[in-house]
């Protein structure tokens, strides 16, 4: 059920997945919504404790029952992810945060006119996830007008502190406002040998690309197809980056495909949700439920309507066996990162993903079309 | 494959599950062997680092491939669990550790003649997991001959420090040497409302009892059967304790069963492994693999032979459908605690557990029979 209300001075007890730092409860909910497993969150507002290092903590939570006990806690703000909600979602966050310093790896600094220009610089830099700008009111005269571009492994600040005279905010790449090159090509028989940030399992290079696009630090990827000679690496999607922002080493290898994140693109195609069905394919993962349904579409809908379901495998009924009742078996599944733990073939399953992330695509497409 | 050799001055890189403290590499391997997911370990011997708080750390590890990269590290000792080995296993550890203080909750102290008597006191106390005894050489005269009985949430010390004049060791309950009452009755229509240490999912009260017996702090349990009115609590096994060591609150409720840990018993029946098959029952969990095999016994054997497999669900082939090939489908599964995440009925599966823990039962039974 969709709960949009937030609960002031309330903390959810238990169910912790991880803690990140966000400048507001609204942004905390955004992070929770896009996290593969988060269903609930507790945000520790400024002055929520005597220890300022605990302020702005956004505690991401999960629960098998989709609910957690509420306890009183001064300064805490709790609520539910929008996974359970029908409305459109966007990763785009245009808000700027006054007198907050969002800490990260400061990899670039320059003098610019105002905070808006600093945000544009961040949006047009491949690595930049968020920025801090020292305004004309910043106490240290030498640092005024300084624009710091930042990134972290997670895409959220490592900590957030109060600091007078600064303004912080996030890159607007996800608002479709980046002016960097958008490379939509997928290159066959190509391995990129740059730094691997992470690896996930994916059924094809398009899903691999979407996962890269959705990942905070992925700039390009290499995908090993089902025909890749090394069995243990089949369906492996390597998420990659480099200092320059471009691949440095391109190697020709059969049955591998490579390409780029679509984070700089104005999307007319889905980049978050994976709507396809994969025939004669089993997605392995942690099982949530088994239900009898008619057809793979109903199975996908059942998965989409279950807030914890990330992907599914559907086994059609054998036609000869039970002509009367043509229901098949629908296995609802999840994993720690939203991707299958393994992909198998030749066992007769039809697999696919929850469509709940499609809500993000449409809004993005809608927002960008007029441009 | 079974690897009994340990690797000196070697650490396994990555794959960390958790860190516990153990007095020796041998005991670390024992903990790893009995942990539901541990396949490899790295033990930090005394003087392995400049920081004595890191000595005696036993880092439990897992790996999808069952191997991890080895790196040089002075004072580290690494090796593999005995899960992969055919030999008998025992949780029984009679060793005592000279000049080591194993830290825990000191809940009872008394003056006794020697370390053996202290170990016997620990063995005959429901809560005691390990002890520290101050010998006649202990620097503080007032504390000499003092026997401290200890427990922790995990059953292993919270830390271990060097301390001259003390001897430490573990309870010998698992050696079948406890003189406390062994209550084998399972009480129908009974709920015990004492402190819950943990809750797991189990197919029946016997498995629930075995899990309680195997758990470091469980003294008794309540199990909600398939007929329990509240659906979300069906098959729930509540692991319990109390200060007195006995249940304080017994409430009559249909479809609940309660009983005691068998940790004080001289076992003539399996208490670690769950050999039964559960018909028309699906065990849900994290999927490892799907293989086509003939019969549920072969499925169980396949699970037992896979070091990471904890339980399975087997779907027999439809007789009418494919008379020629009578293989069914065997789903190999695991979870964080070794128990299914859910149990479902009416879907035609036959489920059961890996038999690798049976190796522990036999040795125990053999050891105890002569008494």
């Amino acid at each position: 059920e969709c709960v949009t209300k937030v609960f002031k001075d309330i903390s959810f007890q238990g169910g912790d997945l991880s803690t990140v730092f966000t400048p507001s409860a609204t942004y905390c909910r955004l992070v929770c919504t896009h996290h593969p497993r988060c269903l609930l969150f507790t945000f520790m507002a400024e002055s929520s404790s005597d220890d300022p290092t605990k302020w702005f903590a956004c505690i991401l939570k999960d629960s098998v029952t989709e609910i957690l006990p509420m306890v009183n806690m001064t300064g805490a703000i709790s609520g539910y992810s929008f996974k359970q909600c029908p409305q459109q979602l966007s990763t785009c966050s245009k808000d700027v945060y006054v007198n907050l310093d969002m800490k990260g790896m400061n990899y670039n600094s320059s003098v610019v006119k105002n905070a808006r220009e600093c945000q544009e610089r961040c949006t047009d830099d491949a690595h930049c996830q968020f920025f801090t700008y020292a305004t004309g009111y910043f106490p240290s005269v030498d640092h005024r007008k300084m624009c710091l571009l930042k990134y972290t492994r997670t895409g959220t600040p490592t900590t957030i502190t109060k600091l007078n005279g600064v303004v912080s905010g996030f890159s607007l790449k996800s608002c479709g406002l980046s002016n960097l090159a958008c490379i939509r090509d997928i290159f066959p028989n190509t391995v990129l040998a740059d730094l691997n940030i992470d690896s996930v399992v994916a059924p094809d290079a398009f899903v691999c690309r979407r996962i890269c696009t959705h990942h905070p630090t992925c700039l390009f990827f290499t995908f090993f197809s089902q025909a890749w000679p090394k069995e243990s690496q089949r369906h492996l999607c390597l998420l990659k980056t480099s200092e320059s922002g471009l691949p440095s080493t391109r190697i020709t290898k059969s049955h591998a495909l490579s390409g780029f994140s679509l984070q700089h693109c104005r999307h007319s195609v889905p980049v978050f949700c994976h709507p396809s069905f994969y025939n004669d394919t089993d997605f392995l993962g942690e099982e949530l439920d088994i239900v009898d349904v008619k057809g793979q579409e109903t199975c996908q809908k059942t998965c989409t309507n279950n807030a914890r379901c990330q992907f599914f495998t559907y086994y059609p009924s054998h036609r000869l066996c039970n002509e009367r009742n043509r229901r098949g078996r629908c296995y609802l599944k999840l994993s720690s990162n939203g991707s299958p733990t393994r992909i198998l073939h030749g066992r007769g399953g039809i697999s696919g993903y929850s469509l709940r992330l499609c809500k993000m695509d449409n809004v993005c497409t809608t927002k960008i079309n007029p441009r | 494959e079974c690897v009994t050799k340990v690797f000196k001055d070697i650490s396994f890189q990555g794959g960390d599950l958790s860190t516990v403290f153990t007095p020796s590499a041998t005991y670390c391997r024992l903990v790893c062997t009995h942990h539901p997911r541990c396949l490899l370990f790295t033990f930090m011997a005394e003087s392995s680092s400049d920081d004595p708080t890191k000595w005696f750390a036993c880092i439990l590890k897992d790996s999808v491939t069952e191997i991890l990269p080895m790196v040089n590290m002075t004072g580290a000792i690494s090796g593999y669990s005995f899960k992969q080995c055919p030999q008998q296993l025992s949780t029984c550890s009679k060793d005592v550790y000279v000049n080591l203080d194993m830290k825990g909750m000191n809940y009872n102290s008394s003056v006794v003649k020697n370390a053996r008597e202290c170990q016997e006191r620990c063995t005959d106390d429901a809560h005691c997991q390990f002890f520290t005894y101050a010998t006649g050489y202990f620097p503080s005269v007032d504390h000499r001959k003092m026997c401290l009985l200890k427990y922790t949430r995990t059953g292993t010390p919270t830390t271990i420090t060097k301390l001259n004049g003390v001897v430490s060791g573990f309870s010998l309950k698992s050696c079948g040497l406890s003189n406390l009452a062994c209550i084998r009755d399972i009480f129908p229509n009974t709920v015990l409302a004492d402190l819950n240490i943990d809750s797991v999912v189990a197919p029946d009260a016997f498995v629930c009892r075995r899990i309680c017996t195997h758990h470091p702090t469980c003294l008794f349990f309540t199990f909600f059967s398939q007929a329990w009115p509240k659906e979300s609590q069906r098959h729930l096994c509540l692991l319990k304790t109390s200060e007195s060591g006995l249940p304080s609150t017994r409430i009559t409720k249909s479809h609940a069963l309660s009983g005691f840990s068998l940790q004080h018993c001289r076992h003539s029946v399996p208490v670690f492994c769950h050999p039964s098959f559960y018909n028309d029952t699906d065990f849900l969990g994290e999927e490892l693999d799907i293989v086509d095999v003939k019969g549920q016994e072969t499925c169980q054997k396949t699970c037992t032979n896979n070091a990471r497999c904890q339980f399975f669900t087997y779907y027999p082939s439809h007789r009418l459908c494919n008379e020629r090939n009578r293989r069914g489908r065997c789903y190999l599964k695991l979870s964080s605690n070794g128990s299914p995440t859910r149990i479902l009925h009416g879907r035609g599966g036959i489920s059961g557990y890996s038999l690798r823990l049976c190796k522990m039962d036999n040795v125990c039974t053999t050891k105890i029979n002569p008494r």
């Epitope: 007890q13 | 709920v191 015990l192 819950n196 240490i197 009115p229 979300s232 609590q233 729930l236």
Partner: nanobody
Framework: QVQLQESGGGSVQAGGSLRLSCTAS????????MAWYRQAPGNECELVST???????YYADSVKGRFTISQDNAKNTMYLQMNNLKPEDTAVYYC????????????????????WGQGTQVTVSS
């Protein structure tokens, strides 16, 4: 979101009475086992009284004959009538549903399907 809300706590002299109420939202009492637990500072959470879905009641030895548990299914409310209160009854009292025992000695941790209220303070002075 299931919520259990206690009320009726307060301060009272030894020998006095209080009536605690527990009201549930998004939840019906009919098929649930309801209970009152309490936790005094530095102590474990302890079961005070239970009323099961089939109407059975249980009382801890320390409160037998002084406390009475009841419920009004129409109002979705459970009560604990506490008479002849003693200083040792001082604690935070928690209402719970389908919760057989507390976890970690704390009257808030639940296992699947179990629920706790936020608690109401009862102080009995001599």
């Amino acid at each position: 979101q299931v919520q259990l809300q206690e009320s009726g706590g307060g301060s009272v002299q030894a020998g006095g009475s209080l009536r605690l109420s527990c009201t549930a939202s998004e939840f019906t009492f009919d098929d649930s086992d309801m209970a009152w637990y309490r936790q005094a500072p530095g102590n474990e959470c302890e079961l005070v009284s239970t009323i099961t879905s089939d109407g059975g009641t249980y009382y801890a030895d320390s409160v037998k004959g002084r406390f009475t548990i009841s419920q009004d299914n129409a109002k979705n409310t459970m009560y604990l009538q506490m008479n002849n209160l003693k200083p040792e009854d001082t604690a935070v009292y928690y209402c719970a549903a389908d919760q057989w025992g507390s976890a970690e000695g704390d009257c808030t941790s639940s296992y699947p399907g179990g629920y706790w209220g936020q608690g109401t303070q009862v102080t009995v002075s001599s």
